[in-house]
């Protein structure tokens, strides 16, 4: 079993990067003298007790930032946040930390990432950019839900 | 406010099933893990299992499996223990309890009032 | 399976600091055991105390606190008050399941 979590860069279709501003992240068109974030992801290792053929549940992290992405109601509706967590602490829990936890699924070379707190509830960018990562379950031109991501060895 | 409130007292015979409900209120089942446990008179607690709500998938411990079955009804907030196969040491108080991560931890946060279950021929 | 083995009964004075142990027969108990530690008190229902071996529940107060002692996982009251008379319950994760001693009766007096 892998126990140390892996890296990678990750961009949307429109080659749009992850960027950290005031605790936000946002995705806004690759630019040089940028510094897109470095996610880093790790397997949940209580994998038999989530739901099968979803996807592989991760933690998602900002490497090094000891940042991880979190789901949360906000009134009646599911957001998308920041929180100060180090992913190894989640990984070591004894019970998956839903909360934390992403379906990931691969088609090709496109990535999604569903909530597992929120089943239906994709990370996703406005297709106009220079927006904050969001939670939608519209899954249409409005957002943008599918991302490449890379890993880095 | 948060509360679990378990059936009432049950009297069974050797050989017989029981099922004990715990009916959740002031929050969803669904985003929580429920734990079922054990205290034989005069013993300590024995964990049983525990049970995902929002999916189903459940954990026992090796001593329970095949003795225990974990199930939940979401649309009424309510979870249920059954046993099978009733021995005069099943005898015991069983309590639900609710699992629940908050801020770094899990932690065992609410309790039902226990369910007294005797078994005697 | 493992056994986890608490003290049977402890007696503190009212305003004085005890200590409860949980120990391990598999050897010293870790982080990685993530020690719970719950409290019951006469008639009434079973209230978590400590999660993740040191962090407090929301709501516990301060003068309960969790934490790893010569190899045992270790609730300690500081400043105990009449209240605090109950039995205590600690349990331990291995791998994928959950061990809980047998429980120590607190009398404060």
């Known amino acids: 079993k892998i126990d140390t979590p892996q890296r990678g860069s990750i961009q949307d279709i429109n080659h749009r990067v992850w960027v950290l501003q005031d605790q936000t992240l946002i995705a806004v068109p690759r630019k040089d003298r940028m510094s897109p974030v470095t996610i880093a992801l790790i397997s949940c290792r209580h994998v038999e007790t989530l739901e099968k053929d979803r996807g592989n549940p991760i933690y998602l992290g900002l490497n090094g930032l000891n940042l991880c992405l979190m789901c949360a109601k906000v009134g009646d509706q599911p957001t998308l946040q920041l929180k100060e967590k180090d992913i190894m602490d989640l990984y070591n829990q004894p019970e998956p930390v839903k909360s934390f936890l992403f379906y990931h699924s691969q088609s090709g070379r496109n990535s999604t990432f569903e909530s597992v707190a929120f089943p239906g509830w994709f990370i996703a960018v406005s297709s106009e950019g220079g927006c904050p990562l969001i939670l939608t379950q519209e899954l249409g031109k409005a957002n943008t839900t599918d991302f490449g991501l890379t890993m880095l060895f | 406010q948060v509360q679990l409130v378990q059936s009432g007292a049950e009297v069974k015979k050797p050989g017989a099933s029981v099922k004990v409900s715990c009916k959740a209120s002031g929050f969803n089942i669904k985003d929580t893990y429920i734990y079922w446990v054990r205290q034989a008179p005069g013993q300590g607690l024995e964990w049983i299992g525990r049970?995902?709500?929002?999916?189903?998938?459940?954990r026992y411990d090796p001593k329970f499996q095949g003795k225990a079955t974990l199930t939940t009804d979401t649309s009424t907030n309510t979870a249920y223990l059954e046993l099978s196969s009733l021995r005069s040491e099943d005898t015991a108080v069983y309590y639900c309890?609710?699992?629940?991560?908050?801020?770094?931890?899990?932690?065992?946060?609410?309790w039902g009032q226990g369910t007294l279950v005797t078994v005697s021929s | 399976q493992a056994v986890v083995t608490q003290e049977p009964s402890l007696t503190v004075s009212p305003g004085g600091t005890v200590t409860l142990t949980c120990r391990s027969s598999?050897?010293?108990?870790?982080?990685?055991?993530?020690a719970n530690w719950v409290q019951q008190k006469p008639g009434q229902a079973f209230t978590g105390l400590i999660g993740?071996?040191?962090d407090r529940a929301p709501g516990v107060p301060a003068r309960f606190s969790g934490s790893l002692l010569g190899g045992k996982a270790a609730l300690t009251i500081s400043g105990a008050q009449p209240e605090d008379e109950a039995d205590y319950f600690c349990a331990l994760w291995y791998s994928n399941h959950l061990v809980f001693g047998g429980g120590t009766k607190l009398t404060v007096l």
């Open positions: 598999t050897g010293a108990v870790t982080t990685s055991n993530y």
């Open positions: 309890a609710r699992y629940d991560y908050s801020g770094s931890s899990f932690y065992f946060d609410y």
């Open positions: 049970i995902d709500p929002a999916i189903g998938t459940t």
């Open positions: 993740g071996t040191n």
